[in-house]
Interface confidence: medium
Amino acid sequence: VPRWRQQWSGPGTTKRFPETVLARCVKYTEIHPEMRHVDCQSVWDAFKGAFISKHPCNITEEDYQPLMKLGTQTVPCNKILLWSRIKDLAHQFTQVQRDMFTLEDTLLGYLADDLTWCGEFNTSKINYQSCPDWRKDCSNNPVSVFWKTVSRRFAEAACDVVHVMLNGSRSKIFDKNSTFGSVEVHNLQPEKVQTLEAWVIHGGREDSRDLCQDPTIKELESIISKRNIQFSCKNIYRPDKFLQCVKNPEDSSCTSEI
């Protein structure tokens, strides 16, 4: 008789999840010499231990502490790029500007990027059928808690000038409910971080508005200023040209506003 299984609203665990995590770990540690000491089997065991046999709506940050410990990594604290709702461009940028880092350029972020996972209470099975949706089911699910945990730690580590890429095509350019708005903004350390610089990425080719004057950006400025951190904002009118100029800064067309 087939056992009754909880049907959640979100997609199930990503296909070949254990193999993907392990393979990514091996690849990452081969490419990054400073992480060569990491034992990927132990990393997978710690990752698995955070959610296997646990109710997928009852996961805590403590569940991920063994994984956090194994994945401890030092990135240059003044080279951090946060992003909100514009992941692909942020990643394209750090692929070119190799001395800057998004969360997904760190081991733990790289391991989990774009993946979904959850288990079931009291069984060692991974649930490939469905996992809890943050809105429809519960917020304390394995994926959401993981990203909350690593995002908080990443923001806490930042110093000097921190950059954040924001999507100017959204109705809420700064969204208080995003990971950036609800976690990272509140965990920047005022004693270490001097300035948060927002890069607002324009979507429309003919869009010449100053999106730094958007009410949600003003809200972000207010939150940041109250935390004794300076705020600055730049419009990136042409993201394609912006990337091109990061690749080839000597190009004559790169002196004009991007």
């Epitope: 997609p11 990503t14 296909k15 070949r16 909100s84 692909d88 993946l115 490939y128 999507n167």
Partner: antibody, heavy 121, light 112 residues
């Protein structure tokens, strides 16, 4: 080299069924989802559904529920689609296409050459 | 279902010049994870479709960098910087943010 080799053209009578195949080579069929897409003559593309060859789980466009049945034979690295109760509306070219990544909403990066189905009495 | 809208034909372009093909969706294709699940395919005459651009702006493997994709949540553009004879065909946009996945009607690239 990744290749998706589809079975040959089919001429079938209204009301009959047809089963077409898509043989994957150059990669492990269980590592990627397999999608099926319909293209009526001179028309656009219509997503029928996909199968996860690892466990046989399928996800179909509601429009093709009861019309298309997706299966896979892992041992021969072959995906199949059976179309039932055929009418002239089902006359089209049917493509199998591999899903680009490990997550269900990724693009289709390799396509078969297509199987032409003609329904005629 | 999300409806993808494309013009049936492009403005005729001369070889070596640039071309733009537009696509719009009835709903935003920007997922809460920050990724826009809009893909572009080219179907050359008598051939199967091939992936050109995935997730709005990423160039698929083996595709020349004359092709680029951009857009917002609902309006998208495929650009070809220097059109070549082999670029002739029908260009389809497709969304994969919400099932059922849907394709645009296709835009035929016209050469002058």
């Amino acid at each position: 080299e990744v290749q998706l080799q589809q079975s040959g053209p089919e001429l079938v009578k209204p009301g009959a069924s047809v089963k077409m195949s898509c043989r994957a080579s150059g990669y492990s069929i269980t590592d990627y989802n397999m999608h099926w897409v319909k293209q009526s003559h001179g028309k656009s593309l219509e997503w029928i559904g996909y199968i996860d060859p690892d466990n046989g789980a399928t996800n179909n466009n509601q429009k093709f529920k009861g019309k298309a049945t997706l299966t896979v034979d892992k041992s021969s690295s072959t995906a199949y689609m059976q179309l039932s109760s055929l009418t002239s509306e089902d006359s089209a070219v049917y493509y199998c296409a591999r899903s680009e990544g490990y997550q269900y909403y990724y693009a289709m990066d390799y396509w078969g050459q297509g199987t032409s189905v003609t329904v005629s009495s | 279902d999300i409806v993808m809208t494309q013009a049936a034909f492009s403005n005729p372009v001369a070889l070596g010049t640039s071309a733009s093909i537009s696509c719009s969706s009835s709903k935003s294709l920007l997922h809460s994870n920050g990724i826009t699940y809009l893909h572009w395919y080219l179907q050359r005459p008598g051939q199967s479709p091939q992936l050109l651009i995935y997730r709005m702006s990423n160039l698929a493997s083996g595709v020349p960098d004359r092709f680029s994709g951009s857009g917002s949540g609902t309006d998208f553009t495929l650009r070809i910087s220097r059109v070549e004879a082999e670029d002739v065909g029908v260009y389809y946009c497709a969304q994969m943010v919400e099932r059922p996945w849907t394709f645009g009607g296709g835009t035929k690239l016209e050469i002058k």
